[in-house]
């Protein structure tokens, strides 16, 4: 058993049918010695008397808010949550496996640049009685500071018969140098509590591996005289790290017909312009990627050919 | 990435082309190592990230773009003295800092070159003959060092008398390649920045 926060405790259970559970001793936070009784949640049934209460915690029915009273007055509370260990592996019932980039990916994180700011998000089908708390650091043995905000519900989607809820959080490394070479990963830890179930999820990454630039901005077409060709030009996204000559991007320019089956023409360039043939009803799209470290491509920025 | 590669203009900063080749070569070598050594811990998540140049050179600090010198988090400076004459500086008026930056890059390359050569000698003794260092990568390191053209004491190649532990050597190779790739990215950024300056 360990304390999650004041008066909230997590009991770790080896979870299998007929498991013996864990013996827990609760102590009433009071100078009083006599006449103390204990109850669980809203029930008025007296579970025991005395300054301490010993209970065998086996199932969720044994978890909840234990309260000690004296003469009708509440003295203190202890909320017991359960953390299930199923065959040596902590349960992951609360969050959905996003399966990208690999199986057992519960937390996904992205950064728009090298400033040390990043966003993480996760999915669940649970809509109520759910709380999250996020902590982060650079490294784990001698952790350096990363400050995270509160997790917020950022999107709701309907997936088949189920509703899916997306939560996200923004974090910022306290003293980040965009040019630094990372040798210790960022660690993100999410505590999730659903009713009386506690779970924790972690992710470990280097900012350089989660970079995904914003799409190029100011995408423009300039027709070339007496030609089917156009000059496409664009700019670095505002959110990208500066100076751009140091934090350079490379670009992919794509000409896509109306039909998805039509052949796509693609050109790769380090410049912020390219000359392409504009077909009728086609669209031109440009996306960006760090020129020197191949992390994710940005989303496409698009303009119609006409 | 297997993308079309632009050839540098003749008037371009001489080292940019070499640094681009270096990054390509080390990335290819790392990819080859990860495929060949699939049963070894060789991915970024599995290895310890060690920097053999730590406390010996200060490339990131010495090569910091001017725009980032206002960022206090970037000024974790280490005092290192370097020789300051190099051919990449030839066609430009350069500050002492730029000379320091390029000589720091040269020292990095020299250190990695020695490590890689020592390691290759060990790998050649492996009866499994599982992996060797790409000669192209070693050649590209050499070319960039020549382009930087710093006069520097030669570091003797380390020779080891004890029987090599090939498992440890291969893990060390992965660690070295990951670190060298990160340094090659920094070198490429620096060369690109200097070219634009």
């Amino acid at each position: 058993i360990w304390e999650l926060k004041k008066d909230v405790y997590v009991v770790e259970l080896d979870w299998y049918p007929d498991a013996p559970g864990e013996m827990v001793v609760l102590t009433c936070d009071t100078p009083e010695e006599d006449g103390i009784t204990w109850t669980l949640d809203q029930s008025s049934e007296v579970l025991g008397s005395g300054k301490t209460l010993t209970i065998q915690v086996k199932e969720f029915g044994d978890a909840g808010q234990y309260t000690c009273h004296k003469g009708g007055e509440v003295l203190s509370h202890s909320l017991l949550l359960l953390h299930k260990k199923e065959d040596g592996i902590w349960s992951t019932d609360i969050l959905k496996d996003q399966k990208e980039p690999k199986n057992k990916t519960f937390l996904r994180c992205e950064a728009k640049n090298y400033s040390g700011r990043f966003t993480c998000w996760w999915l669940t089908t649970i809509s109520t009685d759910l709380t999250f708390s996020v902590k982060s650091s650079r490294g784990s043995s001698d952790p350096q500071g990363v400050t995270c905000g509160a997790a917020t519900l950022s999107a709701e989607r309907v997936r088949g018969d189920n509703k899916e809820y997306e939560y996200s959080v923004e974090c910022q490394e306290d003293s980040a140098c965009p040019a630094a070479e990372e040798s210790l990963p960022i660690e993100v830890m999410v505590d999730a509590v659903h009713k009386l179930k506690y779970e924790n999820y972690t992710s470990s990454f280097f900012i350089r591996d989660i970079i995904k630039p914003d799409p190029p901005k100011n995408l423009q077409l300039k027709p070339l005289k007496n030609s089917r060709q156009v000059e496409v030009s664009w700019e670095y996204p505002d959110t990208w790290s500066t100076p751009h000559s140091y934090f350079s991007l490379t670009f992919c320019v794509q000409v896509q017909g109306k039909s998805k089956r039509e052949k796509k023409d693609r050109v790769f360039t380090d410049k912020t312009s390219a000359t392409v043939i504009c077909r009728k009803n086609a669209s031109i799209s440009v996306r960006a990627q760090d020129r020197y470290y191949s992390s994710s491509w940005s989303e496409w920025a698009s303009v119609p050919c006409s | 990435r297997n993308l079309p590669v632009a050839t540098p203009d003749p008037g371009m900063f001489p080292c940019l082309h070499h640094s681009q080749n270096l990054l390509r070569a080390v990335s290819n070598m790392l990819q080859k190592a990860r495929q060949t050594l699939e049963f070894y811990p060789c991915t970024s998540e599995e290895i310890d990230h060690e920097d053999i140049t730590k406390d010996k050179t200060s490339t990131v600090e010495a090569c910091l773009p001017l725009e980032l010198t206002k960022n206090e988090s970037c000024l974790n400076s280490r005092e290192t003295s370097f020789i300051t004459n190099g051919s990449c500086l030839a066609s430009r008026k350069t500050s002492f800092m730029m000379a320091l930056c390029l000589s720091s890059i040269y020292e990095d390359l020299k250190m990695y070159q020695v490590e890689f050569k020592t390691m290759n000698a060990k790998l050649l003794m492996d009866p499994k003959r599982q992996i060797f260092l790409d000669q192209n990568m070693l050649a590209v390191i050499d070319e960039l060092m020549q382009a930087l053209n710093f006069n520097s004491e030669t570091v003797p190649q380390k020779s080891s008398l004890e029987e090599p532990d090939f498992y440890k050597t291969k893990i060390k190779l992965c660690i070295l390649l990951h670190a060298f790739r990160i340094r090659a990215v920094t070198i490429d950024r620096v060369m690109s920045y200097l070219n634009a300056s």
Partner: antibody
Framework: QVQLVQSGGGVVQPGRSLRLSCAAS????????MHWVRQAPGKGLEWVAF????????YYADSVKGRFTISRDNSKNTLYLQMKSLRAEDTAVYYC????????WGQGTMVTVSS | SYVLTQPPSVSGTPGQRVTISCSGG????????VKWYQQLPGTAPKLLIY???QRPSGVPDRFSGSKSGTSASLAITGVQAEDEADYYC????????????FGTGTKVTVLG
């Protein structure tokens, strides 16, 4: 004590269907994940499928994906395995089993796929 | 489809020490715990070892398990005639959990 009693096995022709049941008692069935495991005659153990305690997630071996469906009825304390498009290579003893560090197995039920 | 490799058979005389190996990889045994099962002919498997080296109550202490890196082993010290059975190791793969990963199985024969 914990008990898992299996039923539903038998002889079936290739291409036909069969449904296995596993009735649980002696524990809170709705709190635990459940597996199906099979063993072809003279061969080793092969995992078939898993279902979460609440039925929200199901996982299958590649060899049965798209043909077998694992389900549970927590109000009846029963686990099921619906087997469709049966093949000769599905011939095996099928076991249900609880998920956890200490597990309980059903007695097994024989499924023979033969024309 | 078996990722955990066991020797097909091992044998010993009563009282001898018999060991069965179970060889896997970094993503399974290297990252997860190992169980061992005993299966007597015509019966369901019986749990002998969980959590690499833990014995459930009722399992004789002549059975012991261990794990090192990407391999595990089961030792029977002082093997007895009633130990003649098939033995299976089991673990998980970090990419496919909760799918059970079984070993190929080992037939233990007690001679004489």
């Amino acid at each position: 004590q914990v008990q898992l009693v299996q039923s539903g096995g038998g002889v079936v022709q290739p291409g036909r269907s069969l449904r296995l049941s596993c009735a649980a008692s002696g524990f809170t069935f709705s709190s635990y994940g459940m597996h199906w495991v099979r063993q072809a005659p003279g061969k080793g153990l092969e995992w078939v499928a898993f279902i979460r305690y609440d039925g929200s997630n199901k996982y299958y071996a590649d060899s049965v994906k798209g043909r077998f469906t694992i389900s549970r009825d927590n109000s009846k304390n029963t686990l099921y395995l619906q087997m469709k498009s049966l093949r000769a290579e599905d011939t095996a003893v099928y076991y249900c089993k609880t998920h956890g560090s200490h597990d309980n197995w059903g007695q097994g039920t024989m499924v023979t796929v033969s024309s | 489809s078996y990722v955990l490799t066991q020797p097909p058979s091992v044998s010993g005389t009563p009282g001898q020490r018999v060991t069965i190996s179970c060889s896997g990889g970094r993503s399974n045994i290297g990252n997860n715990t190992v169980k061992w099962y005993q299966q007597l002919p015509g019966t369901a498997p019986k749990l002998l070892i969980y959590g690499n080296d833990q014995r459930p109550s009722g399992v004789p202490d002549r059975f012991s398990g261990s794990k090192s890196g990407t391999s595990a082993s089961l030792a029977i010290t002082g093997v007895q005639a009633e130990d003649e059975a098939d033995y299976y190791c089991q673990s998980y793969d970090r990419g496919t959990h909760p799918a059970l990963l079984f070993g190929t199985g080992t037939k233990v024969t007690v001679l004489g």
